[in-house]
């Protein structure tokens, strides 16, 4: 039996710059029941506060609702582990909510097979930014990737589309069914998970030109 090991805050993420969550790795418990508490202060302030919500985001986490989230201030966060034998504290973590955004995936993915004048067929992939993202005002600058594969294939083919919310895929095989997904990443943030999978079959009656 011993004091707890040093916890580490290993991840903080915000879906929208309006709320955020931080997660920690507990470290060893020293063989004893161990309590964890997250405390934080904000840049330029002397007050220290305890985590407002340990439940919403699951074990070893702290959720900051709208009421507790500010993009104007850096958060200085630590986690303290305590058992009967003693306590230990994580290194302080500095968090700027602007730089931890992991958005929801893009929405309204639509797939359409089109044909050029020269009879060349392509798949037109279109989507919209995530609902919460105010892209129009420049509040978020979003980049996108799409991935697609035929049903039989093992590997996804990934295309980076920059800020475009549409993409044309050429050289697809007639009669094949293709699966498509999109994801997005804000400036200096993190990729969303891949969005809902959509599928489309390339008709056989279109002939592909070399």
């Amino acid at each position: 039996q011993s004091p707890p090991g040093k916890p580490e805050i290993h991840k903080c993420r915000s879906p929208d710059k309006e709320t955020f969550t931080c997660w920690w790795n507990p470290g060893s418990d020293g063989g004893l029941p161990t309590n964890y508490s997250l405390t934080y202060s904000k840049e330029g302030e002397k007050n220290t506060y305890e985590c407002p919500d340990y439940k919403t985001s699951g074990p070893n986490s702290c959720f900051f609702s709208k009421q507790y989230t500010s993009i104007w201030k850096i958060y200085i966060i630590t986690v303290n582990a305590t058992n009967e034998m003693g306590s230990s504290t994580s290194d302080p973590l500095y968090v700027d909510v602007t730089y931890i955004v992991e958005p929801e995936p893009p929405r309204n993915l639509t797939l359409e097979v089109k044909q050029l004048k020269d009879k060349k067929t392509y798949l037109w992939v279109k989507w919209l930014p995530p609902t919460i993202t105010d892209v129009k005002t420049g509040w978020f600058t979003m980049e996108y990737e799409i991935r697609l594969k035929s049903e039989e294939a093992d590997e996804w083919e990934i295309h980076f589309t920059g800020h475009q919310t549409q993409f044309k895929v050429f050289d697809l095989y007639p009669g094949q069914k293709y699966l498509v997904q999109t994801r997005c990443k804000p400036d200096h943030g993190y990729w969303s998970r891949w969005g809902q999978e959509k599928s489309i079959e390339i008709p056989n009656d279109f002939t592909l030109k070399d």
């Epitope: 290993h10 991840k11 993009i71 500095y94 968090v95 730089y99």
Partner: antibody, heavy 118, light 112 residues
């Protein structure tokens, strides 16, 4: 304790490439961006680019685009900076640096001197 | 790219006396989110740079309170209220509002 340990000094010929490594320890490697900054002898600091080790997404300073490649190996918690088509002006100390969940640098490697000379 | 201009280039200070370094940016450092990402680093002789001040005026963990930062928009100042022998080195201002991040040319602080 957070540590960034860089590879040793290198002497290179003009036109060749150099690859500098930065081994991270004391934290979850995939959680934080790693940046590369260089400093020519007696000069100021110059930001070269950054990588998110979780998915190897990179941003580069356009000045170096096409010549610099930043990579990360999650299995060894190591970031790399490769600079190609070296010229004498690339003689500098190259630093890796780590941010928090912020856009400033809290931890720095010890630096790697790269000398480009014929 | 944003050009960061520091003055003076060098500074010789008597221990216990104050020192002031100015940093001017070629464009506003106010981010679209309202924050100003102007930071100060100190590079002691033979060492890597270390963070002193982040976001204009916030001392980083472990930085003595004799260091203070101020300013807004394009004009910023680092002040050392009472210079100590351990404060010698080159001070750099840096902006991370705009990509690429850029640094000032540095101000060398020596002890008289």
């Amino acid at each position: 304790e957070v540590q960034l340990v860089q590879s040793g000094a290198e002497v290179k010929k003009p036109g060749s490439s150099v690859k500098v490594s930065c081994k991270a320890s004391g934290y979850t490697f995939t959680s934080y961006w790693i940046h590369w900054v260089r400093q020519a002898p007696g000069q100021g600091l110059e930001w070269m680019g950054e990588i998110d080790p979780s998915d190897s997404y990179t941003n580069y300073n356009q000045k170096f685009k096409g010549r610099v490649t930043i990579t990360a190996d999650k299995s060894t918690s190591t970031a790399y900076m490769e600079l190609s088509s070296l010229r004498s002006e690339d003689t500098a100390v190259y630093y890796c640096a780590r941010s928090f969940f912020t856009n400033w640098f809290a931890y720095w490697g010890q630096g790697t001197l790269v000398t480009v000379s014929s | 790219d944003v050009v960061m201009t520091q003055t003076p280039l060098s500074l010789s200070v008597t221990p216990g006396q104050p020192a002031s370094i100015s940093c001017r940016s070629s464009q506003s450092l106010v981010h679209s989110n309202g924050n100003t990402y102007l930071h100060w680093y100190l590079q002691k002789p033979g060492q890597s740079p270390q963070l002193l001040i982040y976001k204009v005026s916030n001392r980083f963990s472990g930085v003595p309170d004799r260091f203070s930062g101020s300013g807004s928009g394009t004009d910023f100042t680092l002040k050392i209220s009472r210079v100590e022998a351990e404060d010698v080195g080159v001070y750099f201002c840096s902006q991370s509002t705009h990509v690429p991040f850029t640094f000032g040319g540095g101000t060398k602080v020596e002890i008289k």
